[in-house]
C-alpha cells in the first residue's frame, strides 16, 4: 500500500484546513491508527491528533476543539483531519503516520500554508495646491502573508514608489503616488488596487483628488456700453472666477462707498435705475483659502441728452 496526501495545503486565515492522508492499501489490509503531528524543523514533533480504529478521535490538549474528522460517510482507510479556523501560527509542516495491518507503518508530510489577506488603508498626502512641484498625493499600505501587491489605477499622470517591510509571518507593502498638482486633476479618482492570493477579487480604495487653486477674476456686464445710460433698470455686474475651495466674492467701490440702492448678491452687483452717481470704479475681490484675486471696472453712466458717448475702460489686476 501507499499513502496519498498533498505536498501543500493552502487555506485563508479563519478557514478550515483539510489535512489529507489516505492509505491506499491492498485488499484485506486494515488501518489501526493514524497519528498526526506538527514537525517543524528545529522543534520536536508536537502531537496533533490520533484517529484510532477502536478508540476514535483523540485531540491533543494544544488543539482541543480545533481538530475534527471530516463529516461522514468516512472510509476506514482515510486518516484525513480538519483543522478548524486556521491561524497564522498553524503554518508549517505536518506529518501523518499510519499504522496498518499487516503491512506495517507509513508516513507522509505536507506543508500547511495560511494566507492572510490584507486589510489595505489609504492615507491622503498633504493638501495639494496648484503651483507645487512633485507632491505626495496618497500612500496605500497593505499587510498580508504572502506580501500583497499594491498598484494604482488612475487617469492622472504621476509617479509611484513602493517599499516593503518583512515581519516574522507577514509583509507590509506601502506604495506612494506622487504628482504635480494642477486644477485639471480636481475631482479625479485615484484608486489603490491591492492583489493577494487570499482575496477572491482585488481590493480597491478610491481617493478623490482635491487641488486648491484660484483662477484670474474678470467682470462681465459692461460688454455693451450703450446699455449703461440714465434710467436703465436691471443693470448688473457679475464677477467671474473659479477655484477650489469655491471662492467668496466681495464688491467695493474704489472712489468711495457703494451707492445706496446697489445690492451685493455674492458674485453679482445689482443696480437700481441708473443715475450719474453710479459712475465710478468698482472692484470685485475674489478669495479662497488658497489665494485672492481682484478685478476692477470703470462704469460711466451715459446721459442720452449728451451727444457724445463716453469710453468704458476695463482693467484686471491680480
Amino acid at each position: 500500500g501507499e499513502l496519498e496526501t498533498s505536498d501543500v495545503v493552502t487555506v485563508v486565515l479563519g478557514q478550515d484546513a483539510k489535512l489529507p492522508c489516505f492509505y491506499r492499501g491492498d485488499s484485506g489490509e486494515q488501518v489501526g491508527q493514524v497519528a498526526w503531528a506538527r514537525v517543524d524543523a528545529g522543534e520536536g514533533a508536537q502531537e496533533l491528533a490520533l484517529l484510532h480504529s477502536k478508540y476514535g478521535l483523540h485531540v491533543s490538549p494544544a488543539y482541543e476543539g480545533r481538530v475534527e474528522q471530516p463529516p461522514p460517510p468516512r472510509n476506514p482507510l482515510d486518516g484525513s483531519v480538519l483543522l478548524r479556523n486556521a491561524v497564522q501560527a498553524d503554518e508549517g509542516e505536518y506529518e501523518c503516520r499510519v499504522s496498518t495491518f499487516p503491512a506495517g507503518s507509513f508516513q507522509a508530510r505536507l506543508r500547511l500554508r495560511v494566507l492572510v489577506p490584507p486589510l489595505p488603508s489609504l492615507n491622503p498626502g498633504p493638501a495639494l495646491e496648484e503651483g507645487q512641484g512633485l507632491t505626495l498625493a496618497a500612500s496605500c499600505t497593505a499587510e498580508g502573508s504572502p506580501a500583497p501587491s499594491v498598484t494604482w489605477d488612475t487617469e492622472v499622470k504621476g509617479t509611484t514608489s513602493s517599499r516593503s517591510f518583512k515581519h516574522s509571518r507577514s509583509a507590509a507593502v506601502t506604495s506612494e503616488f506622487h504628482l504635480v498638482p494642477s486644477r485639471s486633476m480636481n475631482g479625479q479618482p485615484l484608486t489603490c488596487v491591492v492583489s493577494h492570493p487570499g482575496l477572491l477579487q482585488d481590493q480597491r480604495i478610491t481617493h478623490i483628488l482635491h487641488v486648491s487653486f484660484l483662477a484670474e477674476a474678470s467682470v462681465r456686464g459692461l460688454e455693451d456700453q450703450n446699455l449703461w445710460h440714465i434710467g436703465r433698470e436691471g443693470a448688473m455686474l457679475k464677477c467671474l472666477s473659479e477655484g477650489q475651495p469655491p471662492p467668496s466674492y466681495n464688491w467695493t467701490r474704489l472712489d468711495g462707498p457703494l451707492p445706496s440702492g446697489v445690492r451685493v448678491d455674492g458674485d453679482t452687483l445689482g443696480f437700481p435705475p441708473l443715475t450719474t452717481e453710479h459712475s465710478g470704479i468698482y472692484v470685485c475681490h475674489v478669495s479662497n483659502e488658497f489665494s485672492s484675486r481682484d478685478s476692477q471696472v470703470t462704469v460711466d453712466v451715459l446721459d442720452p441728452q449728451e451727444d457724445s458717448g463716453k469710453q468704458v475702460d476695463l482693467v484686471s489686476a491680480s
Epitope: 491508527q33 502531537e47 490520533l50 477502536k54 478508540y55 478521535l57 483523540h58 491533543s60 490538549p61
Partner: antibody, heavy 126, light 107 residues
Framework: EVQLVESGGGLVQPGGSLRLSCAAS????????MSWVRQAPGKGLEWVSV????????FYADSVKGRFTISRDNSKNTLYLQMNSLRAEDTAVYYC???????????????????WGQGTLVTVSS | DIQMTQSPSSLSASVGDRVTITCRAS??????LAWYQQKPGKAPKLLIY???SLQSGVPSRFSGSGSGTDFTLTISSLQPEDFATYYC?????????FGQGTKVEIK
C-alpha cells in the same frame, strides 16, 4: 502467561522513603508502557504514574509529582516506583499494571490496563 | 483533569437480573473508555475497552456502549461470580481517571 509481581511495600513513617518493584514475565517487557495505580483502604482506584516502553516519557499524578519517581530496567524486566517524602494519604495498595499495546508512538493518550499485579500495601504512619 | 461520574454507587440485584451501570465523562472522550471488575482483596480485571470491545476471555454477558460523554456497562444475566465492584476509566488524557466505582451486591 503474563505475570506482574509487586514487592517493597511495608510500614514507613511520614517523610520517609520506599522503593517498590514490579517484576514482569510472560511478555516482551520493553514493548509496553507500564503504570502504577493505587487504592487507599476502602476507596476507589487512583492512577499514579506511567512510563513509556523505553523510558523516554514519564507522567505523574499531581498528588505525587516531585515526590515519586517511576523508572524501569528493561534488561531486568522490572518496573520501579521510588517514593520519597511519604504522607499519611499515600497509604494504599500499590498495583503495577501493563498498558494495552494498541496505540503506537503517541504519548498524549493512555491505553487500558490489561494486566495487573496482585498489589503491595504501603502504610504511612507514625 | 477529566472527571468520571458513575451511577449508581451501589445496587442490589439477583442472579439472572439485567444490570446496567452508567458512567459520564466531564468532557468528550470519544471511545477512550475501559471497564474493570474488582473483587475484594484482588486486583482489578479489564472487562471492556474502547467503550464496547470485549476483552479476551471475558464472558459475552458483559457488554459496553456509548461514545463521547455517556457510557453504559450492561450485564445481561447476572451470575454469582459477577458480584463485585465495577470501575470505568477514561484514558483519553493524562492523567487517566477512574469513576468512583459501583458495588453490585446480592439482593
Amino acid at each position: 502467561e503474563v505475570q506482574l509481581v509487586e514487592s517493597g511495600g511495608g510500614l514507613v513513617q511520614p517523610g520517609g522513603s520506599l522503593r517498590l518493584s514490579c517484576a514482569a514475565s510472560g511478555f516482551i517487557f520493553d514493548g509496553y508502557d507500564m503504570s502504577w495505580v493505587r487504592q487507599a483502604p476502602g476507596k476507589g482506584l487512583e492512577w499514579v504514574s506511567v512510563i513509556k516502553d523505553h523510558g523516554g516519557y514519564k507522567f505523574y499524578a499531581d498528588s505525587v509529582k516531585g515526590r515519586f519517581t517511576i523508572s524501569r530496567d528493561n534488561s531486568k524486566n522490572t518496573l520501579y516506583l521510588q517514593m520519597n517524602s511519604l504522607r499519611a494519604e499515600d497509604t494504599a495498595v500499590y498495583y503495577c499494571a501493563r498498558e494495552y499495546s494498541d496505540v503506537v508512538d503517541y504519548v498524549s493518550v493512555r491505553t487500558p490496563l490489561d494486566y495487573w499485579g496482585q498489589g503491595t500495601l504501603v502504610t504511612v504512619s507514625s | 483533569d477529566i472527571q468520571m461520574t458513575q451511577s449508581p454507587s451501589s445496587l442490589s440485584a439477583s442472579v439472572g437480573d439485567r444490570v446496567t451501570i452508567t458512567c459520564r465523562a466531564s468532557q468528550g472522550i470519544s471511545s477512550y473508555l475501559a471497564w474493570y471488575q474488582q473483587k475484594p482483596g484482588k486486583a482489578p480485571k479489564l472487562l471492556i475497552y474502547a467503550a464496547s470491545s470485549l476483552q479476551s476471555g471475558v464472558p459475552s454477558r458483559f457488554s459496553g456502549s456509548g461514545s463521547g460523554t455517556d457510557f453504559t456497562l450492561t450485564i445481561s444475566s447476572l451470575q454469582p461470580e459477577d458480584f463485585a465492584t465495577y470501575y470505568c476509566q477514561q484514558h483519553y488524557t493524562t492523567p487517566p481517571t477512574f469513576g468512583q466505582g459501583t458495588k453490585v451486591e446480592i439482593k
